[in-house]
Interface confidence: low
């Protein structure tokens, strides 16, 4: 029991339990499909323990298997507009280093205004995750509608 209490005093990073929960900062210019994220206690219910944000993109600092999750809600959207603007798609992938570039998640909005998904995937130190939203509709910045995160699960 005493050992378990002592463990709780250690920072999350030292336990190898890297975790991040991010909220949308802004979208990129027209030819840049990436979503730009932000995180930190000053912003409310978002945080980074281990991973870092570089120019709004999430970079992994510890090798391991991660749970990656994302929810994106389109702003000013109804099922009618969503189907009319089809295809609007969201893709999450490793965008750098180039040698590890791969798509991890790909989702289409079809006739809905919100998509959410998660998966377990191995990630390595230095991997940068990009979230690409293609289509003409813009995402909501409401923190309970659009969010993105990773959680280290095991080596």
């Amino acid at each position: 029991q005493r050992f378990a209490q002592a463990q709780q005093q250690l920072p999350l990073e030292s336990l190898g339990w890297d975790v991040a929960e991010l909220q949308l900062n802004h979208t990129g210019p027209q030819q840049d499909p990436r979503l730009y994220w932000q995180g930190g206690p000053a912003l409310g219910r978002s945080f980074l323990h281990g991973p870092e944000l570089d120019k709004g993109q999430l970079r992994i600092h510890r090798d391991g298997i991660y749970m990656v999750h994302i929810q994106v809600t389109l702003a000013i959207c109804s099922s009618t507009t969503a189907s009319r603007h089809h295809p609007t798609t969201l893709a999450v992938g490793i965008c750098s280093p180039a040698s590890r570039s791969i798509s991890l998640l790909r989702l289409s909005f079809h006739q809905g205004c919100t998509i959410a998904s998660q998966r377990l995937t191995p990630l390595a130190r230095g991997d940068t995750l990009c979230t690409n939203l293609t289509g003409t509709l813009l995402p909501s910045r409401n923190t309970d509608e659009t969010f993105f995160g990773v959680q280290w699960v095991r080596p």
Partner: antibody, heavy 125, light 107 residues
Framework: QVQLQESGPGLVKPSQTLSLTCTVS??????????WGWIRQPPGKGLEWIGS???????YFNPSLKSRVTISVDTSKNQFSLKLSSVTAADTAVYYC?????????????????WGQGTMVTVSS | DIQMTQSPSSLSASVGDRVTITCRAS??????LNWYQQKPGKAPKLLIY???NLQSGVSSRFSGSGSGTDFTLTISSLQPEDFATYYC?????????FGQGTKVEIK
């Protein structure tokens, strides 16, 4: 072509705030894929990145200076600005503004591809 | 922060010489490495981006190579206008950091 020009006082007293403005000509500060950055170079020394701003207002700072730095953008004037508070003699440097260009390839490298000519700022009483 | 270390700090060379400057990162930065040239009293000028790509308008006598932690800038045949200080810079991680510079002087 795009040109950058720094302006601001060349002499600032210790503990005061250094304020510089960079005016962009020959192109829009709102152009896609460009950040706008500040870099400084103390006399006889190397280059230090201070921070960069995206036209929408997203900012990225050097953590060693973050608590003292404010970078803002005024798209209507095609300008971006630097404020550095509580300056000391160690902040004496040539301050450069630069276009911080993110190349939209698969892995998004970025460069400082266009620079202003620099402005010398001395911190002294 | 990622530390960038250049060597040598200075070198003397003659016109026509082949000159190589090295830059080492304190951790792997993939190909996120840029090279700049700075002449006295002037702003730096971008030469090479993403380790090996020549910036538009820059002479082809400049070339860059490397990946991971070790990078080189090569000037194939030094010209009088190449006497300057050269800086490497990583764009892998914030904060963006520069090497301390290599001054190329006339022998």
């Amino acid at each position: 072509q795009v040109q950058l020009q720094e302006s601001g006082p060349g002499l600032v007293k210790p503990s005061q705030t250094l304020s510089l403005t960079c005016t962009v000509s020959g192109g829009s500060i709102s152009s896609s894929s460009y950040y706008w950055g500040w870099i400084r170079q103390p006399p006889g020394k190397g280059l230090e990145w201070i921070g960069s701003i995206y036209h929408s207002g997203g900012t990225y700072f050097n953590p060693s200076l973050k608590s003292r730095v404010t970078i803002s953008v005024d798209t209507s004037k095609n300008q971006f600005s630097l404020k550095l508070s509580s300056v000391t003699a160690a902040d004496t440097a040539v301050y450069y503004c630069a276009r911080h260009y993110e190349i939209l390839t698969g892995y998004y490298p970025d460069v400082f591809d266009i620079w202003g000519q620099g402005t010398m700022v001395t911190v002294s009483s | 922060d990622i530390q960038m270390t250049q060597s040598p700090s200075s070198l003397s060379a003659s016109v026509g010489d082949r000159v190589t400057i090295t830059c080492r990162a304190s951790q792997s930065i993939s190909s996120y490495l840029n090279w700049y040239q700075q002449k006295p009293g002037k702003a730096p000028k971008l030469l090479i981006y993403a380790a090996s790509n020549l910036q538009s308008g820059v002479s082809s006598r400049f070339s860059g190579s490397g990946s991971g932690t070790d990078f080189t800038l090569t000037i194939s045949s030094l010209q009088p206008e190449d006497f300057a200080t050269y800086y490497c810079q990583q764009s892998f991680s914030s904060p963006r950091t520069f090497g301390q510079g290599t001054k190329v002087e006339i022998k």
